[in-house]
């Protein structure tokens, strides 16, 4: 699996999307987990509704929400009030019994809140926001890791 990078701004919301084949994963609950180290386990953060038919209902665990469009084949995770400690490697998973298929590997990067910069003339808002209010809409910037890039910094 390639790793997709999603960037969000500290204090704002970040939306991560994981597309999948809706027929291949028909009847499967989904989950969002955080990778603990390069070789470590993936620790479950939140999973979709216990009843697959109700997967469209948003479920929260703390500041993380998950919802699944099972017909369209898109799992959406929202990280609310993004903080620097939220940065790291995650996975979207499709669940069956004790098994979990990886749908997408995600690297979450947290950018400094531009409002922390005191010079208002240097403010940058994601997207093409025209007003101050628009700057706080949910957004994400995503890309795939380039070949050779590693999601975890080398340990000394």
């Amino acid at each position: 699996h390639n790793t997709t990078v999603f960037q969000g701004v500290a204090g704002q919301s970040l939306q991560v999307s994981c597309p999948y084949d809706s027929m291949k994963h028909w009847g499967r609950r989904k989950a969002w987990c955080r990778q603990l180290g390069e070789k470590g386990p993936c620790q479950r953060v939140v999973s979709t509704h216990n009843l697959w038919l109700l997967s469209f209902l948003r479920r929260w665990n703390g500041s993380t929400a998950i919802t699944d469009d099972t017909l369209g084949g898109t799992l959406t995770i929202t990280l609310r009030n993004l903080q620097p400690h939220d940065a790291g490697l995650y996975q979207c998973q499709s669940l069956h019994g004790s098994e979990a298929d990886t749908l997408r590997k995600v690297l979450v990067e947290v950018l400094a809140d531009p409002l922390d910069h005191r010079d208002a003339g240097d403010l940058w808002f994601p997207g093409e926001s025209e007003s101050f209010e628009d700057a706080h809409v949910e957004h994400s910037i995503s890309r795939s890791l380039l070949e050779g890039e590693i999601p975890f910094p080398p340990t000394s």
Epitope: D21, M23, K24, H25, W26, G27, L51, W52, H96, G97
Partner: antibody, heavy 121, light 107 residues
């Protein structure tokens, strides 16, 4: 009618290669996993592996990993089971089966009629 | 991998009687268990999936109880067409594994 039709019986010598087939009809072949099951003479059923023809995602049971190759051609709705070098111990009946996924559980609901493979010198 | 055991290996029953077949898993398989019937020279036929859901066209005399590690398939009143081999299959952990089977024959 939803069905899986397998290729005919084969008699082979040890060391020879072989590919048997399983053709699906009456349903969207790309949207269901196809599993392969072995049954040696007078014995029970053994799960070999499974393939999703939509993207050729393939999983093998550890016992069969490296022993066989599972593939599919979605353009002709056919799954395959292949050996590069047969052994006498490969003599068995081989079944393909469709896995239907659902909210109440998974089901190998449609089975092929089986292909008898005999390997003998 | 999960090891499935079935008992008895052979069950001799008279037509019209009740047959009780057991399937045990070496660890919990939740409700991810199926039962199949196989007659000599034929492909297996799905009877039950999701531990207790009867497949299309399977008569009500076939029922399953249990979950986790212990499952029981009951055929309430054996008909002549029910004499066959019965296999359970767990699909909770990879790889899926079949039980060794129970032969139900005529007493």
């Amino acid at each position: 009618e939803v069905q899986l039709v397998q290729s005919g019986a084969e008699v082979k010598k040890p060391g020879e290669s072989l590919m048997i087939s399983c053709k699906g009809s009456g349903y969207s072949f790309t949207n269901y996993w196809i599993g392969w099951v072995r049954q040696m003479p007078g014995k029970g059923l053994e799960w070999m592996g499974i393939i999703y023809p939509g993207d050729s995602d393939t999983r093998y049971s550890p016992s069969f990993q490296g022993q066989v190759t599972i593939s599919a051609d979605k353009s002709i709705s056919t799954a395959y089971l292949q050996w590069s070098s047969l052994k006498a111990s490969d003599t068995a009946m081989y079944f393909c089966a469709r896995r239907r996924q659902g909210i109440w559980g998974d089901a190998l609901d449609i089975w092929g009629q089986g292909t008898l493979v005999t390997v003998s010198s | 991998e999960i090891v499935m055991t079935q008992s008895p290996a052979t069950l001799s029953v008279s037509p019209g009687e009740r047959a009780t077949l057991s399937c045990r898993a070496s660890q919990s398989v939740s409700s991810n268990l199926a039962w199949f019937q196989q007659k000599p020279g034929q492909a297996p036929r799905l009877l039950i999936y999701g531990a207790s859901t009867r497949a299309t066209g399977i008569p009500a005399r076939f029922s399953v109880s249990g979950s986790g590690t212990e499952f029981t398939l009951t055929i309430s009143s054996l008909q002549s067409e029910d004499f066959a081999f019965y296999y359970c299959l767990q699909d909770n952990n990879w790889p899926p594994t079949f039980g060794p089977g129970t032969k139900v024959d005529i007493k």
